[in-house]
Structures are given as C-alpha cells and as structure tokens.
Amino acid sequence: ATKLTEEKYELKEGQTLDVKCDYTLEKFASSQKAWQIIRDGEMPKTLACTERPSKNSHPVQVGRIILEDYHDHGLLRVRMVNLQVEDSGLYQCVIYQPPKEPHMLFDRIRLVVTKGFSGTPGSNENSTQNVYKIPPTTTKALCPLYTSPRTVTQAPPKSTADVSTPDSEINLTNVTDIIRVPVFN
C-alpha cells in the first residue's frame, strides 16, 4: 500500500490557512470536490464540498471554510479563516467518485494552530470571518457536514437522486502531475 504523506502547516490563532489543491486534468473540472478532516481512528468527515457539478469560480462558504474551484487553472482553493486552536488536525482535499473511495489530492495537510499572533509579514493577523464574507446567494452547504465547535453549518438538502448505483461512478485513472501550492495570505 502507498504510504500517505503529510505536509505540516503551523499557524497562529486568527490567521488563515490558504491551500490550493491542483488537480491539473481537465476531466476533473466539474467533479465534485470536498475538504475533509481525519480524526485519529475515525473515518474522514466532510467539512465542506463544492456543488454537483462543481461550478467554476463559484465560492461555497460553510462557517469559516471557503471553497473555490477554478476550472481554468485546475485547482481547488481552500481557505479556513480565523483559525482556532481546535482546528488543529489532519485534512485532505478529495474528488468524490462514489461509490468508489474519494480520490485524495496531494499530501494530507497537518494543521497546527497555536495561540497568539506570529507578527510575521504576510501572516494576516487581522483575518476574521468578515474579511472573506461571501454574499448569501453563494453561501451554500451541500454535503452531509461535520459540525466542529466553532463552525456553523447548514443541513444538507434532501436528495432526490439515488446515487447508490454504479451509474454514478466517476472513473479516475492516470492521475499524474499533481502539485499543491500552499499560499499564506
């Protein structure tokens, strides 16, 4: 089995994690993507996901998490604003492909949030939820959602489609040339 690697991000409370998950291949542009947390010994939990099909440059905000899928650049931008110590944990960007396991993009992200501000250039000390406030018309929660202590989520919509059949499979093969560019605002 392939060993899963992690990339560590150390940030202070109030800062913003800004990650760009590059999927490069055009065939995945409209695929639904998600940001997940992995707690020790548990199945991953979905924190937020894009629409189905994923819309270009269409921001989705769930609490302090913002997802933007840029089809033309082949990347999913994930921002977690106003970080709190309890946000520390292991995260991953994935492409949904039910009923198969999600396809994980890049290394998992080990986020460590500590108290206090770093005071370093570009650390975005003033980052708050208001900085990235998205108009209500684009604020959506489209997945079964994990509710963390400081993340307000909405209930998922009632599904009218039964996607438990193989008809909904997305075939992911030859996923190569994948890189991730960490960006700190």
């Epitope: 997940q36 189905r52 009923p99 396991e101 079964p144 959602l145 998922p156 599904s159 438990s164 193989p166």
Partner: antibody, heavy 124, light 108 residues
Framework: QVQLQESGPGLVKPSETLSLTCAVS?????????WGWIRQPPGKGLEWIGS???????YYNPSLKSRVTISVDTSKNQFSLKLSSVTAADTAVYYC?????????????????WGRGTTVTVSS | DIQMTQSPSSLSASVGDRVTITCRAS??????LNWYQQKPGKAPKLLIY???SLQSGVPSRFSGSGSGTDFTLTISSLQPEDFATYYC??????????FGGGTKVEIK
C-alpha cells in the same frame, strides 16, 4: 440485481475461530463500496462488526477489533469474516452488507444491500 | 462510542394510524442518521438516509426528520406490511457505526 449470500459453519466451539464468507453477485466488489459484517444476537439489536474496501482498507468496531479480521478476494468477488476466541456471547445471526459512507458520497450513505443472514451458534 | 436511544421500545397501532418513532443520540451527529426496517427472520432494509432522504423504492408514507441529537421516523398511515422492528443508525463518529435498540411496531 445485487445479491449477497453468507456461508459458513452454523456451529462453532468456544475458544475457536468463527469463519464466514459473503459471496457477491450482480456487482463487482472492485467497482466500489465498502463491504461489511453486522450481527444480531437472538432477540436483540444490530451490532456492526466492521467493513472492508477492495483495496484492503478496513474499519473495525473497537469492541471487537482484537478478535476480528475481514479480508477480501476480488478474484472470487467475495469477502470474509474471521472472529477468534468465540464465546456463547458471539451466538448471533451474521449479515453481510454493502456499505457506502458519507465521506465518499455527498448524497447517499448507508447499508443498501444485505444478505439474508446466517445463524452461528457457539456451543460445545 | 455514540449511544443511540430509541423510544418507545415497542408500540401497538392499527392500520391507518400515524406512527412516530424517536431516536436520540448521546451527542450531536448532524444529519448522519439512517433508519432501517426489519421483519422477523429477514435482513434489515434501508428506509431513510441522511435523516430525511427516502431510499429508492420506499413508500412515501415513510418520512424522517431531525438533526443534531433528536430524530424522528414517521409512518403517516400504517399499512399491514409495516408491522416490523425499526432501527436508527448513526454514521457520524465512526468506527463504530452504532444502531439504536429498536422499536417494535405491533398490531393493536
């Protein structure tokens, strides 16, 4: 349509290992889903044992983890359960099921296809 | 582990009655809750997933609601084939996936 069929000994002696197999027809295990085991003691409720993906990734119930092994054979399109050091408390109807978890499907999750179940009695 | 408590453990009702079964989780499980129906000698059958979504092929008289810790399964007009035991199931903090103790719906 997708069908699951459990098979294995109906009687197991205490301290021995219970072994069951679930044969899947109408769907290739390699195409997706987790494949799991659930049991139901006589007159009682349901207890999830664990599940496996075709890649070999497994999830187990912590209360049984030390005694449970679930494996998969994609060439035969089947998966198996082994439960060691059994006691009378392991007497139950054992079901296999197809499972889809919320982290891999944003619109649907649950155990949508079940086998008929097989009764296993632990007794000397 | 998250404990799932169903109430009542059993109930008697007549054909045509509206039946409500509740399930309470020991901590918030968002909407990661499913409902199953089990008839004697048979395997469970998935009725409702994600708290309120009706599984394909399940009659519309079945409905689910709730989020967080409190959930409800409602049968709007009980039919003869609905007499069975109903289980809730959480898939939030997993493993383990856990089930409620069951509610047996009997004929009055």
């Amino acid at each position: 349509q997708v069908q699951l069929q459990e098979s294995g000994p109906g009687l197991v002696k205490p301290s021995e290992t219970l072994s069951l197999t679930c044969a899947v027809s109408g769907y290739s295990i390699s195409s997706g889903y987790y494949w799991g085991w659930i049991r139901q003691p006589p007159g009682k409720g349901l207890e999830w044992i664990g599940s496996i993906y075709h890649s070999g990734n497994t999830y187990y119930n912590p209360s049984l983890k030390s005694r449970v092994t679930i494996s998969v054979d994609t060439s035969k399109n089947q998966f198996s359960l082994k439960l060691s050091s059994v006691t009378a408390a392991d007497t139950a109807v054992y079901y296999c099921a197809r499972e889809l978890y919320a982290y891999s499907s944003p619109m649907f999750y649950g155990m949508d296809v079940w086998g008929r179940g097989t009764t296993v009695t632990v007794s000397s | 582990d998250i404990q799932m408590t169903q109430s009542p453990s059993s109930l008697s009702a007549s054909v045509g009655d509206r039946v409500t079964i509740t399930c309470r989780a020991s901590q918030s499980i968002s909407r990661y809750l499913n409902w199953y129906q089990q008839k004697p000698g048979k395997a469970p059958k998935l009725l409702i997933y994600a708290a309120s979504s009706l599984q394909s092929g399940v009659p519309s008289r079945f409905s689910g609601s709730g989020s967080g810790t409190d959930f409800t399964l409602t049968i709007s007009s009980l039919q003869p084939e609905d007499f069975a035991t109903y289980y809730c199931q959480q898939l939030y903090h997993a493993p383990p996936i856990t089930f409620g103790g069951g509610t047996k719906v009997e004929i009055k």
